[in-house]
């Protein structure tokens, strides 16, 4: 988790002087509770936005937006703590809005936004906005949280972001898999424009099970420049085992930008349809 660039982040708006500060996610008001605390944020919204760095790279960011409740507690609102928690790693990053002037009611509802948390493809986050100061130990909570799922690199807008392009998102191998006689699969895919090796990964499963009955890989050496964008054809020999008939084929590239952690593309071959065998007709009728 990180913030996009390190240029001065602003949270000021007409009628409010505000500065954005790094936060340890442990606001001072946890340790020194205040008697009077503001109410919680209202209408917290998280959306996927895209932003360029100063170097011109494009990253997905969490666009966080919320409004204030129209009650007198805004008189005691000193700022907000924004927290983003990546759920699969438990990594957390926080920033603090510090209000340098007192809020006053005005004809429009106060609205705040922040779009500088860089998020990763195919990850889920919990975004929390805490109004400051935080409540006393038994006080009503004054935060709001929402989960936010970032699409993977198959998503049209995500595909052209720097992290997705670095993992090979622009490569479309257009995999075709064909079942041949004698327990063989013919795999065909389009090579990318980089002299790097590939691996075809085959996992076979029984018809209705998810525990593999065969695992195999086939190494494809780095193509020469004249082979870039050409089709590569490989014939894989399957395990001759009745019922080991559902096959998942993955192509793993080893591009220089993502090394051994590049996006894999896959295709699946289902088990052949079994013809419905008619019920045998008994040649005698039981009498009971």
């Amino acid at each position: 988790l990180r913030l996009l660039d390190h240029r001065a982040l602003v949270c000021s708006q007409p009628g409010l002087n505000c500065t954005v500060k790094n936060s340890t996610c442990l606001d001072d008001s946890w340790i020194h509770p205040r008697n009077l605390t503001p109410s919680s944020p209202k209408d917290l919204q998280i959306q996927l936005h895209f932003a360029h760095t100063q170097q011109g790279d494009l990253f997905p960011v969490a666009h966080i937006e919320w409004t204030l409740q129209t009650d007198a507690s805004i008189l005691y609102l000193e700022g907000a703590e924004l927290s983003v928690l990546q759920l699969n790693t438990n990594e957390r990053l926080c920033v603090r809005f510090e209000f340098l002037s007192k809020l006053r009611h005005h004809h429009r509802r106060w609205r705040f936004t922040f779009s500088h948390f860089v998020v990763d493809p195919d990850q889920e986050y919990e975004v929390t906005v805490h109004h400051l100061p935080k409540p006393i130990p038994d006080g009503d909570p004054n935060h709001q949280s929402k989960n936010f799922l970032v699409p993977d690199c198959e998503h049209a807008r995500m595909k052209v972001t720097t992290p997705c392009m670095s993992s090979g998102s622009l490569w479309d191998p257009n995999i075709t898999v064909e079942t041949l006689e004698a327990h063989q699969l013919r795999v065909s895919f389009t090579l990318w424009n980089e002299s790097t090796h590939y691996q075809i990964l085959l996992t076979s499963f029984p018809h209705m099970e998810n525990h593999s009955c065969f695992e195999h890989m086939h190494h494809i050496p780095a193509p020469r420049p004249e082979e870039f964008h050409q089709r590569s054809n490989v014939t894989l020999t399957l395990r001759n085992l009745k019922g080991c008939c559902r096959h998942q084929v993955q192509i793993q590239p080893f591009f220089s930008s993502c090394l051994n952690d590049c996006l894999r593309h896959s295709a699946t071959v289902s088990c052949p349809e079994m013809p419905d065998t008619p019920e045998p007709i008994p040649d005698y009728m039981p009498l009971w």
């Epitope: 691996q199 990964l201 593999s212 065969f214 695992e215 890989m217 395990r239 993955q250």
Partner: nanobody, 113 residues
Framework: EVQLVESGGGLVQAGGSLRLSCAAS????????MAWYRQAPGKQRELVAQ???????NYGDPVKGRFTISRDNAKNTVYLQMNSLKPEDTAVYYC???????WGQGTQVTVSS
Amino acid sequence: EVQLVESGGGLVQAGGSLRLSCAASGFTLSDRAMAWYRQAPGKQRELVAQVNSIGSTNYGDPVKGRFTISRDNAKNTVYLQMNSLKPEDTAVYYCNAPLYNYWGQGTQVTVSS
């Protein structure tokens, strides 16, 4: 938590032998396809040897006839026996479960002439 831990690397003279081990924890190696890769300084990671789930093996061209991949299911370990070592075999050797993209941290093999 899945861990692949390589061992057995070291310094050896050209023509000598080494046996690398890859011990798995949190993951059962039997019925799994496994591989060894290596990476020399400034070069791409390259395939050394592979074994599929039913024991068929495949080797990278530079090591064919000299290296042998095997596994011991009881010990949950994959081995790479390296004979007739050459200076160009100097690299960090990595154990890999390719279908799951599990990698070990690598073990250094240095072959002096």
